[in-house]
Amino acid sequence: CDLPQTHSLGNRRALILLGQMGRISPFSCLKDRHDFRIPQEEFDGNQFQKAQAISVLHEMIQQTFNLFSTEDSSAAWEQSLLEKFSTELYQQLNDLEACVIQEVGVEETPLMNEDSILAVRKYFQRITLYLIERKYSPCAWEVVRAEIMRSLSFSTNLQKRLRRKD
């Protein structure tokens, strides 16, 4: 399965939209910073078969979509930007789902992939727990926005590596 160039562009558009969503200066939230322990090794495409990498990407985008589809998220962000952002993520999920179906037929995905997906889920659990602990404050959302921008940047790099493998 060849991930279309439009998928990468969609990811870039999602990053740009997320960058525009801020309502307060990140510099007023320096104290709120938190180490979410991003599972960087899961974004290293070198150690994965293609099917594994695609399902990690899918999980990453799915969890991001879920995070920004909550009522608390709707209250935190400007509605039209949030809708555009969610639309970009939804389109990427569709692209990736088609690829997952195609690739899993070609390669049997070993248990290692389940570990990778679990690592991504736990990472998003840590993000959600942080938001709950900080009572979904504007600064907590600002920190989460920065973190998701980081993880989307990692996933963009993983996509580039996948295309180079093709």
Partner: antibody, heavy 121, light 113 residues
């Protein structure tokens, strides 16, 4: 290993501008804030401002507002500090320092080697 | 802006003896949401950039010898060098990162008596 490498020493005339660069390697550039700190000869440390590359958002100390511009180029992992309307009292060593936005403490954990800017007619 | 005041301005201590530097902030740098003090200590030797020693008022940066320790909370902080070594001769700065603009103390010069 994270490294911040700054551009070389500059000699400038009063009223002119200087632009100092700071190239980062060995870390995820966009995940951090880059601060600029200056130190006049024999004096203490003074925070001028900073930028969070992932947002492109800069913040400046009131003293330098309107005279300093801090930018970042994610594609080259380089931050820049431009100071305009230079006067003799701007003669100092200018440092860039990484502030771990992407981590869980706020401290300047890696520093550039410093750039001496001399303002003299 | 938060004003940071260090004392003393300079300090002469015999090798192997204890050196104590104080730092006072004009307002609390303790953040109630995570109970952390946003105060750091740096060491600067001549011709070199500052080096981070302590963050969160009392957490040693990795690789920093355990003779360096930080304490205090709210507005009053202390950096202690338990047994001064020749290589500890430097200027020490406290810095708050509770709010922008970040501000530094004026520095304390530590020398050997």
């Amino acid at each position: 290993q994270v490294q911040l490498v700054q551009s070389g020493a500059e000699v400038k005339k009063p009223g002119s501008s200087v632009k100092v660069s700071c190239k980062a390697s060995g870390g995820t550039f966009s995940s951090y804030a880059i601060s600029w700190v200056r130190q006049a000869p024999g004096q203490g440390l003074e925070w001028m401002g900073g930028i969070i590359p992932i947002f492109g958002t800069a913040n400046y100390a009131q003293k330098f507002q309107g005279r300093v511009t801090i930018t970042a180029d994610e594609s080259t992992s380089t931050a820049y500090m431009e100071l305009s309307s230079l006067r003799s009292e701007d003669t100092a060593v200018y440092y860039c320092a990484r502030d771990s936005w992407g981590s869980y403490y706020a401290a300047l954990d890696y520093w550039g080697q410093g750039t001496l800017v001399t303002v003299s007619s | 802006d938060i004003v940071m005041t260090q004392s003393p301005d300079s300090l002469a201590v015999s090798l192997g003896e204890r050196a104590t530097i104080n730092c006072k902030s004009s307002q609390s740098v303790l953040y109630s949401s995570n109970n952390k003090n946003y105060l750091a200590w740096y060491q600067q030797k001549p011709g070199q950039p500052p080096k981070l020693l302590i963050y969160w008022a009392s957490t040693r940066e990795s690789g920093v010898p355990d003779r360096f320790s930080g304490s205090g909370s709210g507005t009053d902080f202390t950096l202690t060098i338990s047994s001064l070594q020749a290589e500890d001769v430097a200027v020490y700065y406290c810095q708050q990162s509770f709010d922008v603009p970040y501000t530094f103390g004026q520095g304390t010069k530590v020398e050997i008596k």
